[in-house]
Interface confidence: medium
């Protein structure tokens, strides 16, 4: 089956600087700035565009150690993400895989929301854990937090 | 429900070897890193090391290093902790728990198993 | 020696609140949103209480909670109860620190 769950959360980031930071150097900046969550991504093939393979590689003590993650699509105009978990972490038993969509929008304050879609694809009747679903909102919190707090403190930063 | 359940007292000699074991249920046992806790009697908790049992990768902490070993049969969902020659000193009471979190809290926790050596 | 520092005791009557303290670094407690805190009754394994500096697990009471200013997180137990009498715990994520360590241990008495 096909679950899907949305998440909106907003940033004091304007929408093209964040795109930038979090998106496009997503790979170098995120684990410098949040080691705590991931240590390492490494690029198994692709050059960024569609198609790429990355392993994301997770500090020791974290359930699971590491994911492998597809790009799906790169939107650089209307600063849309999406990329497929495809093997790793939660996929593998009773899920195939998750597909996400990131669209990061502008909002008048000079700011913008960050609208996420989560699709878990599961085996057969296998229904997605709440738990699942939290730790993986949470993740993403946490590493959103991480780069806006880098980009505050170095304003001159991804600009 | 995520539950770790742990193997019963223990009375030893010194000298003498040890393995206590650790089961766990409830989740993807393979996918979650273990920890062993020490507690000596009337002390506080010491973490000795961790395990992931996916692939046996494991971390001691150093004062823990080349004292114990630590191992993980994911086929029967068991940690293990072992001692080839035990001493008095390591009289105390042993937990093992999942870590979990981002990364690192320590939820679920075994009942503990207590370890007497004594001559 | 603990690089989580946490006064041996604290006590409180039956409805005060108490606060107990746990002090480190900006290598750990004041680095990350990572500090949790854990109950141990004579006896019995440590439970959790707090995780990520202010959450609480289902099944605690609303009367725990954790808080954090700098390099110092607390947690604070209010309407103190007898069954709140028992040894707490800190633990902080760390970069760079090759083991996990617990703050020494603050023995609460509900007096």
């Known amino acids: 089956g096909v679950f899907n769950y949305e998440i909106e959360t907003t940033s004091v980031i304007p929408a093209a600087r964040l795109f930038k930071a979090f998106i496009l150097d997503g790979d170098n900046l995120v684990p410098k700035v949040a080691p705590q969550a991931i240590s390492s991504v490494e690029n198994i093939e692709g050059n960024g565009g569609p198609g790429t393979i990355k392993k994301i590689n997770f500090p020791e003590g974290f359930p699971f150690k590491y994911v492998k993650d597809r790009v799906d699509e790169v939107d650089h105009t209307n600063f849309k993400y999406n990329y497929s978990v495809i093997e790793g972490g939660p996929v593998g038993d009773t899920l195939e895989k998750i597909s996400n969509e990131i669209k990061i929008v502008a909002t008048p304050d000079g700011g913008c929301v960050l609208k996420i879609s989560n699709k878990y694809h599961t085996k057969g009747n296998h229904e997605v854990k709440a738990e699942q679903v939290k730790a993986s909102k949470e993740m993403g919190e946490t590493l959103l937090r991480a780069v806006e707090s880098y980009l505050l403190a170095h304003s001159d930063a991804y600009n | 429900e995520v539950q770790l359940v742990q193997s019963g007292a223990e009375v030893k000699k010194p000298g003498e070897s040890l393995r206590i074991s650790c089961q766990g249920s409830g989740y993807r046992f393979s996918n979650y890193w273990i920890a062993w806790v020490r507690q000596l009697p009337g002390k506080g908790l010491e973490s000795m090391g961790i395990i992931y049992p996916g692939d046996s990768d494991t971390r001691y902490s150093p004062s823990f290093q080349g004292q114990v070993t630590i191992s993980a049969d994911t086929s029967t969902r068991t940690a293990y902790l072992q001692w080839n020659s035990l001493k008095a000193s390591d009289t105390g009471i042993y937990y093992c728990v999942r870590l979990g979190g981002i990364p690192d809290w320590f939820d679920p926790w075994g009942q503990g198993t207590r370890v007497t050596v004594s001559s | 020696s603990y690089e989580l520092t946490q006064p041996p005791s604290v006590s409180g009557s039956p409805g005060q609140s108490v606060t107990i303290s746990c002090t480190g670094t900006?290598?750990?407690?004041?680095?990350?949103?990572?500090v949790s805190w854990y109950q141990q009754h004579p006896g019995k394994a440590p439970r959790l209480m707090i995780y990520?500096?202010?959450k609480r697990p289902s099944g605690v009471s609303h009367r725990f909670s954790g808080s954090k200013s700098g390099n110092t997180a607390s947690l604070t137990i209010s309407g103190l109860q007898a069954e709140d009498e028992a040894d707490y715990y800190c633990?902080?994520?760390?970069?760079?620190?090759?083991?996990?360590?617990f703050g020494g241990g603050t023995k609460l008495t509900v007096l």
């Open positions: 990520e500096d202010t």
């Open positions: 900006s290598s750990d407690v004041g680095g990350y949103n990572l």
């Open positions: 633990y902080s994520y760390a970069t760079g620190r090759p083991s996990r360590l």
